[in-house]
Structures are given as structure tokens and as C-alpha cells.
């Protein structure tokens, strides 16, 4: 089974403001999985609709 994402490196602990960093294997770049109530590429915005 090929994983679609890896853990981000330690250097990226602050990459996501309110979320978890995942390194996308195919795109070869980091991305953020936002905590509940946050949105944005870096989970930097509070979700006003939540």
C-alpha cells in the first residue's frame, strides 16, 4: 500500500498555525489538516461558520 502522505519533518513544526502538518507524497510539499474551527492553507483563519 502506497501512502499518500508522510509526517512532516521536525523543521515544519510551525508550518500549520492551528492544524497538523502532513507531507503530500505525490505533490512533494507540506499541507495542513486543520483543527476543528479553523480554515485556510495554513489553518490560520477561524472558521466563522463553524
Amino acid at each position: 500500500v502506497v501512502s499518500h502522505f508522510n509526517d512532516c519533518p521536525d523543521s515544519h513544526t510551525q508550518f500549520c498555525f492551528h492544524g497538523t502538518c502532513r507531507f503530500l507524497v505525490q505533490e512533494d510539499k507540506p499541507a495542513c489538516v486543520c483543527h476543528s474551527g479553523y480554515v485556510g492553507a495554513r489553518c490560520e483563519h477561524a472558521d466563522l461558520l463553524a
Epitope: 521536525d10 523543521s11 512533494d28
Partner: antibody
Framework: VQLQQSGAELVRPGASVKLSCTAS????????MHWVKQRPEQGLEWIGR????????KYAPKFQDKATITADTSSNTAYLQFSSLTSEDTAVYYC?????????WGQGTTLTVSS | IQMTQSSSSLSVSLGDRVTITCKAS??????LAWYQQKPGNAPRLLIS???NLKTGVPSRFSGSASGKDYTLSITSLQTEDVATYYC?????????FGGGTKLEIK
């Protein structure tokens, strides 16, 4: 997909200089951009990085007061600026972005500090 | 994180299988790159993620990982492979590089 760096610089001691690194084929906002130094006949040394999406920077301690890294997302370009240059700053400087499957390095900019 | 390349130089013969080793002082979870550099040239990225061969790099180059130990192998050394090789960790900041291993022909 590449990183294109500015041309060689010859500057006087005490002066300042700003080197550039323009990305094509990817968006610099996607990940951190880094700068690396290599003095003549020496190894490689990490200077620091920038998160182009928000301007946040991190530097190796020895470069904290020497280097300033900035980025302009509209031109997809990262910059490395030096102040109060000395002969110790004579080196080749590389910009780079690294992933797990791929990595990108500029061709390097030679900086010579000489009176 | 310290990266140690135990050999600063290796005396090799053309056609040899060459192994260059790099040891990390901490776990870096395969966030390791290998570079080839020839005098007057920029470092050339060979491998990222410990094992991923960059497009265009000959298949005689390969990378492997075992715990904190990383290896670059060249199956049959060619004249154009004579260079200095560096490892680099990019798991944590600051990024750190090994001191380099220079291949010299016997």
C-alpha cells in the same frame, strides 16, 4: 521547474548586497525557501530559511546579525541580503527547496568581497 | 543534528563498487539528501528522501537507510563519478551537512 539566481557580485568591505532567487514551475509559498553558503574549497553551511507565505524567518546563530532573508510572492522570488560585508563573506550562495522525492537548487551566486 | 561522513577521502579504482557512509547523531527519519560536487561546480542533487534518485541521475547510484546510518552506493565507478560527495539532513533546522567524501583514483 528551476531556481534562477542573480549574477556574480564584487563588493567592497563594509558594503551591503542583495542576492535574488526566482522560482519557475512552482509557487514559493508552497514550502520554505532556504539559503546555503559555500566558501572556497570548503563544505556547505545552512544560513537560514523563510516561509514566503508569511515572511517568518529562521537563521543559523552565526548568521543572525549578518543575513536577512526576504521573499516577494508576487514575483516568486526569495532574497538574501548581507550587511557590513567582510572577506569572510566571500563565497558561493545557493537558494534551495527540498522535498522527499525532489529537490531544487539554484546555480549559485558568487559573492567576492574585496577592496 | 550532526552528520558524520567517516571517510574524508577514498582511494578507488574505475569499475569498483563504492560505498559512502553518513551517520546522523539523531533520528532524521530518512530526510536525507546526497550531493555530488566537482571543482568549480554547484552541488548536484543525486538523492532525496534517502532513497529517491533524482531524474537524470544514472541508475548505478543508489541510497539506503538503516536507523541513523545512511549509505550512498555506486555500483561500477565511472571516470565522471570522481568528485566529492556530501550528505545532508533536512529533518530539523538548522540543516546540517556531512564534511564530504572525496573520491580519488588509485
Amino acid at each position: 521547474v528551476q531556481l534562477q539566481q542573480s549574477g556574480a557580485e564584487l563588493v567592497r568591505p563594509g558594503a551591503s548586497v542583495k542576492l535574488s532567487c526566482t522560482a519557475s514551475g512552482f509557487n514559493i509559498k508552497d514550502d520554505y525557501m532556504h539559503w546555503v553558503k559555500q566558501r572556497p574549497e570548503q563544505g556547505l553551511e545552512w544560513i537560514g530559511r523563510i516561509d514566503p507565505a508569511n515572511g517568518h524567518t529562521k537563521y543559523a546563530p552565526k548568521f543572525q546579525d549578518k543575513a536577512t532573508i526576504t521573499a516577494d510572492t508576487s514575483s516568486n522570488t526569495a532574497y538574501l541580503q548581507f550587511s557590513s560585508l567582510t572577506s569572510e563573506d566571500t563565497a558561493v550562495y545557493y537558494c534551495t527547496r527540498m522535498g522527499l522525492r525532489r529537490g531544487y537548487w539554484g546555480q549559485g551566486t558568487t559573492l567576492t568581497v574585496s577592496s | 543534528i550532526q552528520m558524520t561522513q567517516s571517510s574524508s577521502s577514498l582511494s578507488v579504482s574505475l569499475g569498483d563498487r563504492v560505498t559512502i557512509t553518513c551517520k546522523a547523531s539523531e533520528h532524521i527519519n530518512s530526510w536525507l539528501a546526497w550531493y555530488q560536487q566537482k571543482p568549480g561546480n554547484a552541488p548536484r542533487l543525486l538523492i532525496s528522501g534517502a532513497t529517491n534518485l533524482k531524474t537524470g541521475v544514472p541508475s548505478r547510484f543508489s541510497g539506503s537507510a538503516s536507523g541513523k546510518d545512511y549509505t550512498l552506493s555506486i555500483t561500477s565507478l565511472q571516470t565522471e563519478d570522481v568528485a566529492t560527495y556530501y550528505c545532508q539532513q533536512y529533518w530539523g533546522t538548522p540543516w546540517t551537512f556531512g564534511g564530504g567524501t572525496k573520491l580519488e583514483i588509485k
